[in-house]
C-alpha cells in the first residue's frame, strides 16, 4: 500500500495516427504505477469501450484494431494497488 499522495499523470499525446491504428504516448513519474488502464471509446456511439492495460514501466503503446475515419476518445489512468488516478483524455480522428 502506498503512503502519502500518489502523483497524477502528466499529459497524454497521440504520437502517430494511422488508417486503423494509433500510437499513444504519456508522461508519468517513474515507479509510481503498477499499470496503466486505457479505454478506447468510439465517439457518439453506445458501443462498449475497448479496454487494455500496459505495464507501469511503459510510457507508450500501440492501439490496433481501430476503424478508419472514426472519432475516438482515449482515456488513460494510472493504477497502484490501492489507488487510481484521475483519468486523462484525448480525442483523435483516424
Amino acid at each position: 500500500a502506498s503512503t502519502g499522495e500518489t502523483p497524477n499523470l502528466g499529459e497524454v499525446v497521440v504520437a502517430e495516427v494511422g488508417w486503423d491504428a494509433l500510437k499513444l504516448n504519456w508522461t508519468a513519474p517513474e515507479g509510481a504505477y503498477e499499470y496503466f488502464f486505457i479505454q478506447v471509446q468510439e465517439a457518439d456511439t453506445v458501443e462498449a469501450a475497448q479496454n487494455l492495460t500496459v505495464p507501469g514501466g511503459l510510457r507508450s503503446t500501440d492501439l490496433p484494431g481501430l476503424k478508419a475515419a472514426t472519432h475516438y476518445t482515449i482515456t488513460i489512468r494510472g493504477v497502484t494497488q490501492d489507488f487510481s488516478t484521475t483519468p486523462l483524455s484525448v480525442e483523435v480522428l483516424t
Epitope: E34, Y35, F37, Q39, Q50, N51, L52, T53, P55, D62, P64, G65, R77, V79, T80, Q81, D82, F83, S84
Partner: antibody, heavy 121, light 107 residues
Framework: QVQLVQSGAEVKKPGSSVKVSCKAS????????ISWVRQAPGQGLEWMGA????????NYAQKFQGRVTITADKSTSTAYMELSSLRSEDTAVYYC??????????????WGQGTTVTVSS | DIQMTQSPSSLSASVGDRVTITCRAS??????LGWYQQKPGKAPKRLIY???SLQSGVPSRFSGSGSGTEFTLTISSLQPEDFATYYC?????????FGQGTKVEIK
Amino acid sequence: QVQLVQSGAEVKKPGSSVKVSCKASGGTFSSYAISWVRQAPGQGLEWMGAIIPILGIANYAQKFQGRVTITADKSTSTAYMELSSLRSEDTAVYYCARLYGYAYYGAFDYWGQGTTVTVSS
Amino acid sequence: DIQMTQSPSSLSASVGDRVTITCRASQGIRNDLGWYQQKPGKAPKRLIYAASSLQSGVPSRFSGSGSGTEFTLTISSLQPEDFATYYCLQNGLQPATFGQGTKVEIK
C-alpha cells in the same frame, strides 16, 4: 498464496437469475481483474467478462451483454457474477479467475474451484 | 471482438511425438496470449503466458512462440499425462477470447 473460493452449486428455473460469488484471499484484490469463464458440459471455455474492482469498470463479452452483471465488493474482496433470463443452455460450470494480462502484468493465474449452475424446469 | 481460431480441433498422437497447436488472432494483438491445459472435471491450468513465457512448475517440453496474429504451442515429446484439451486465450484487448480448444488423444 492467492485463493479464489466460489459459492456452491445452484439449480435454477428457466427465466430466473443466478448470482455466483468469488472470494479472494492471500493477495491484493482491488487492482487485479477478476474474470468469469464458463464451460457447458462437453464444451470449450467461454470468457464472459471481467471487472477491475479499484476502477469499478467491467467488460463483457458481446454474447452476454445485457444479461450478465459483474460487480465487486472491495471491503470483502469478493466478486460477483449475476446472469439473468436463464435458459437451459446456461447449464455450465462457472469459474472465476485472475488471469495474466488484463490489469497487471505479473505472472499469476489463479482459478476458483468452479460453481455448477443447472437450469431446469 | 477478436476471434481466436485454434487448429486442429483434435489430434491423435503417441507418447514421444512432437505436437504443435496453432492459434490465429483475427487482428494483431500484443503478446498477451496464454496456453491452457484442461483435464476432465478440473479447472484449466496455464502452461504459457505472454506468448512464450513458461509458467513456473510446467515442464520444459512445453513451449510457446509467435507474435502479432499467429501463435504456436509445442510439446516437444508427448508424455502420458499430456493427453488433455488445450486452449489459447487472448487477454490483452478486452473482451478476452478463447480458442475453440484442441483435444489431444492417444493414437
